[in-house]
């Protein structure tokens, strides 16, 4: 199974030695160390943490650990001119103001440099006007408002609840609807689980808690001023007017105590249905404007944040491969946090730290991986995946030639119910096999495998006896590796029970209350879930770096391609008349998928039989596996999204967090019935089917016998 030519540890014990070295107590200790002060991107505190991690990774035994710095566009509140929202009366007097900060969590009263809640990259502005409640500000919410309810958001300030989709998509939708400002708030329906106390007595969001976050629509660009290229010392920077993805209207987040004050006065239309009602004691009227007695009152935003080019630092550690040093397996997660980062990112960073320590221990005993392992502590993830993207832009030529796999390592937990994995289909079998070898940490599954508890709690909707594995979307540092460069990628963490907990993310996400104590008291007191995630992430890296034959199964790609083709075909078939009129056929796509399936099957047979002692043939077969993901990359990218180049997967145009399959075709079909020029619209559908079919066929051919 796993083996290595350059080890003094018996090959079959390599993985066991690595896994046995991982200790929950160490992860706990590292988490504590990483969460005592804020580590906001671009600050001195985060630079000092970068240097600490560099020093410790060197001590752990990595061959080299370097800092890679970039000067990127970040966003900060004005320290002397705070952001807030008011209700003003007819005389312009402020009769209510939202909170300037969150009440400090116990034990942190005297911590300085806690950034107040803000929406990163909001432009400055002081718009005032009537309020319109837009539910989650999803595409379908604005359709409901504009098309069904005939409510015009133009010139209005909209208030939207967090959840369901990435906040940047909410802001984009509001801009397109003509809004002049956006207020984002956390509704208890989404961020307060029934039967659980609020922090500091449980893991629910208190009324004064607020979710920070960036509101960019970068579409994979990285630093807004240097799209496509690294933000280095000699970079040419765009002017701010040409920057990628910046919002054009002021945006600000608030908690549910303050939201109550704004929403309780709302008049106008009643909510269209119960799905628009949250859990506050307010009518959830849509507006526009306030009711009766309050109709002369308006809402005013006061936003004074500034965008600043600031230096950020990635930490890049290298453990050189003994046999294939020019093949890179990358484990990366970010280091920057909004405040203390108790979950996001430090529960992930602590796991990476322990994985590095374990690999380092083996290396000190004389072992080396077959392939090179790169470890990364990314900066400025919270500001738009900037650290990882700039580094990948700087190293893109190396990565596209040498990148075997990328394993992401942000938050290790978002709950403590079961495992959650999103990855390329190439990694399905790796994940299945690995989790069958690991012990489940779950109550009631003592002595059972992780695979068993995961499958029981999160079954695959398609295949009985198998666990759910989701598509990769975005919103994390794997984006540039997978969506732009076509490097096989995966992520794993412990999650909540989505059946019983309908709230979005975890309640304290990006708030000041994401502390060490949150994790240690309420999520994982024994750090057993953290340890399991370390075993999964570390085990995947180990196998990817150490297996003689890469642990990728191309047949699993064939299966999902057929599923995705069926799905997009059925979406298109909702318009049978137009398909007939415009001669839209999916035959080429289904034919390509069929060819892929047959060629993948034959390749897998050859993979079983070839002479693994022949290094040239071994390398050839491994290269075909490594480059398969790369073969799904279209160098021209998706329409209007040049940095999303993967033809099979892209972040949804309506929710950056979600993955969409055959995104080119999907977007061409989306809302096609409302297009003013149906002939042109269906022509684009046909073009996208052509691109997809060609890409699948071309990818299949990379698996054919080379001669």
């Amino acid at each position: 199974k796993s083996s290595n030519e350059a080890t003094n540890i018996t090959p079959k014990h390599n993985m066991k030695a690595f896994l046995d070295e991982l200790k929950a107590e160490n992860i706990k200790k590292f988490l504590y160390n990483f969460t005592q002060i804020p580590h906001l991107a671009g600050t001195e505190q985060n630079f000092q943490l970068a240097k600490q991690i560099q020093s410790q990774w060197k001590e752990f035994g990595l061959d080299s650990v370097e800092l890679a710095h970039y000067d990127v566009l970040l966003s900060y509140p004005n320290k002397t001119h705070p952001n807030y929202i008011s209700i003003i009366n007819e005389d312009g007097n402020e009769i209510f103001n939202t909170s300037l900060f969150e009440p400090p969590p116990p034990g942190y009263e005297n911590v300085s440099d806690i950034v107040p809640p803000f929406s990163a990259f909001s432009p400055q502005g002081m718009p005032e006007g009537d309020l319109v409640y837009v539910n989650y500000a999803r595409t379908e919410d604005f359709f409901k408002l504009e098309r069904d309810m005939k409510i015009n958001c133009s010139g209005k300030i909209v208030i939207a609840r967090y959840g369901k989709v990435f906040r940047g998509n909410k802001v984009k939708n509001a801009q397109l609807a003509g809004a002049k400002g956006v207020i984002l708030y956390s509704d208890p329906a989404d961020y307060f689980a029934p039967g659980v106390k609020s922090y500091p007595d449980g893991w629910n969001l208190p009324g004064g808690g607020v979710q920070r976050g960036n509101i960019l629509n970068l579409n994979g660009a990285g630093d807004p001023l240097t799209p496509g290229y690294p933000a280095n010392e000699y970079a040419y920077r765009r002017g701010i007017a040409e920057a990628v993805g910046l919002p054009s209207i002021p945006v600000h987040p608030i908690g549910y105590y303050d939201a109550q004050k704004l929403l309780e006065k709302m008049g106008g239309s009643a909510p269209p249905d119960s799905s628009w009602r949250g859990s506050l004691k307010v009518p959830y009227n849509v507006g526009p404007g306030f009711t009766g007695n309050f109709s002369t009152q308006k809402v005013k935003m006061h936003i004074h944040s500034t965008n600043e080019v600031t230096r950020i630092y990635n930490v890049i550690g290298t453990l050189r491969g003994a046999v294939e040093p020019d093949r890179y397996v990358i484990l990366g997660g970010h280091r920057d946090s909004w405040v203390f980062g108790g979950i996001d990112p430090q529960s992930g960073a602590a796991v990476v730290h322990e994985i590095v320590r374990s690999f380092g221990t083996l290396k000190k005993e004389g072992w080396r991986p077959r392939r090179t392992i790169l470890f990364a502590s990314w900066d400025a993830e919270e500001f738009g995946l900037l650290g990882s993207t700039e580094w990948a832009e700087e190293n893109s030529r190396l990565l596209q030639e040498r990148g075997v796999a990328y394993i992401n390592a942000d938050s290790s937990i978002e709950g403590n119910y079961t495992l959650r994995v999103d990855c390329t289909p190439l990694m399905y079998s790796l994940v299945h096999n690995l989790t069958k070898e690991l012990k489940s940490p779950d109550e009631g599954f003592e002595g059972k495998s992780l695979y068993e508890s995961w499958t029981k709690k999160s079954p695959s909707p398609e295949f009985s006896g198998m666990p759910r594995i989701s598509k990769l979307g975005s919103g994390n540092d794997f984006e540039v590796f997978f969506q732009r460069l076509g490097i096989a990628s995966g992520r794993a963490r412990y999650t909540k029970n989505w059946e019983t907990n309908k709230f979005s993310g975890y309640p304290l996400y990006h708030s000041v209350y994401e502390t060490y104590e949150l994790v240690e008291k309420f999520y994982d007191p024994m750090f057993k879930y953290h340890l399991t995630v370390a075993q999964v992430r570390g085990g995947m890296v180990f196998e990817l770096a150490n297996s003689i034959v890469l642990p990728f199964d191309c047949r699993d790609y064939a299966v999902v391609l057929r599923k995705y083709a069926d799905k997009i075909y059925s979406i298109s078939m909702k318009h049978p008349q137009e398909m007939k009129t415009y001669s839209v056929s999916f035959d080429s796509l289904f034919s390509a998928v069929k060819n892929f399936t047959e060629i993948a099957s034959k390749f897998s047979e050859r993979l079983q039989d070839f002479d693994k002692s022949n290094p040239i043939v071994l390398r050839m077969m491994n290269d075909q596996l490594m480059f398969l993901e790369r073969a799904f990359i279209d160098p021209l990218g998706l329409p209007d999204r040049p940095f999303y180049r993967h033809v099979i997967y892209a972040p949804s145009s309506h929710n950056k967090y979600a993955g969409e399959s055959f995104p080119g075709i999907y977007d061409a079909l989306f809302d096609i019935e409302s297009k003013v020029d149906p002939s042109k619209a269906w022509g684009e559908v046909k073009r996208q089917i052509y691109v997809a079919a060609f890409t699948v066929q071309a990818a299949a051919e990379t698996l054919s016998e080379v001669a």
């Epitope: 300037l100 009440p103 116990p106 009263e109 106390k197 500091p200 007595d201 208190p206 008291k521």
Partner: antibody
Framework: EVQLVESGGGLVQPGGSLRLSCAAS????????MAWVRQAPGKGLEWVAS????????YYLDSLKSRFTISRDNAKNSLYLQMNSLRAEDTAVYYC????????????WGQGTLVTVSS | DIQMTQSPSSLSASVGDRVTITCRAS??????LAWYQQKPGKAPKLLIY???TLADGVPSRFSGSGSGTDFTLTISSLQPEDFATYYC?????????FGGGTKVEIK
Amino acid sequence: EVQLVESGGGLVQPGGSLRLSCAASGFTFSDYYMAWVRQAPGKGLEWVASINYDGSSTYYLDSLKSRFTISRDNAKNSLYLQMNSLRAEDTAVYYCAGSDGYWAWFAYWGQGTLVTVSS
Amino acid sequence: DIQMTQSPSSLSASVGDRVTITCRASGNIHNYLAWYQQKPGKAPKLLIYNAETLADGVPSRFSGSGSGTDFTLTISSLQPEDFATYYCQHFWSTPPTFGGGTKVEIK
């Protein structure tokens, strides 16, 4: 009707110890944070300590945390304050108070019990 | 720690007067402020929380206002039973400190 009844006060010598109790009724005791607030003769109110719903978290005035211990027994609807190494400046009426969370006002108050530290 | 400063420390007024007491916090506490009334030999009684919300059973002549650092308790028409000492208290962070008190006496 909500009732908080303090007991255990009295005269104690400097360096001595005292344990105050507060018996609660008329509300769901375990749904409330509880606290001790004191008032020296002729002076204002001073918060002493708080305890969360189940007793797993306690909070103290910094200057008192090494000498005072707050605890509760939800089964008995009771709150306690163990005071050690008492000093003359600890002389005060000690009130038991209830609030419905960490960030909350004191909605319920007891009538107080007088602690006198004197030789 | 956040300090609460009340003023005046005492005032004399007549029945029917409008009385205003102010409270200043040393840091921004948003609206995390409560007002209490205490009569001699009695326990404090909650009047107002969240800076402006009247507690159950409190007469409407009492009102609170303010946000951030500056707060006001107003008694619109002083009644005989209102002669007492009034305290503000923040609950923004630990420790939750009280103001020094304002004694309202009969003129």
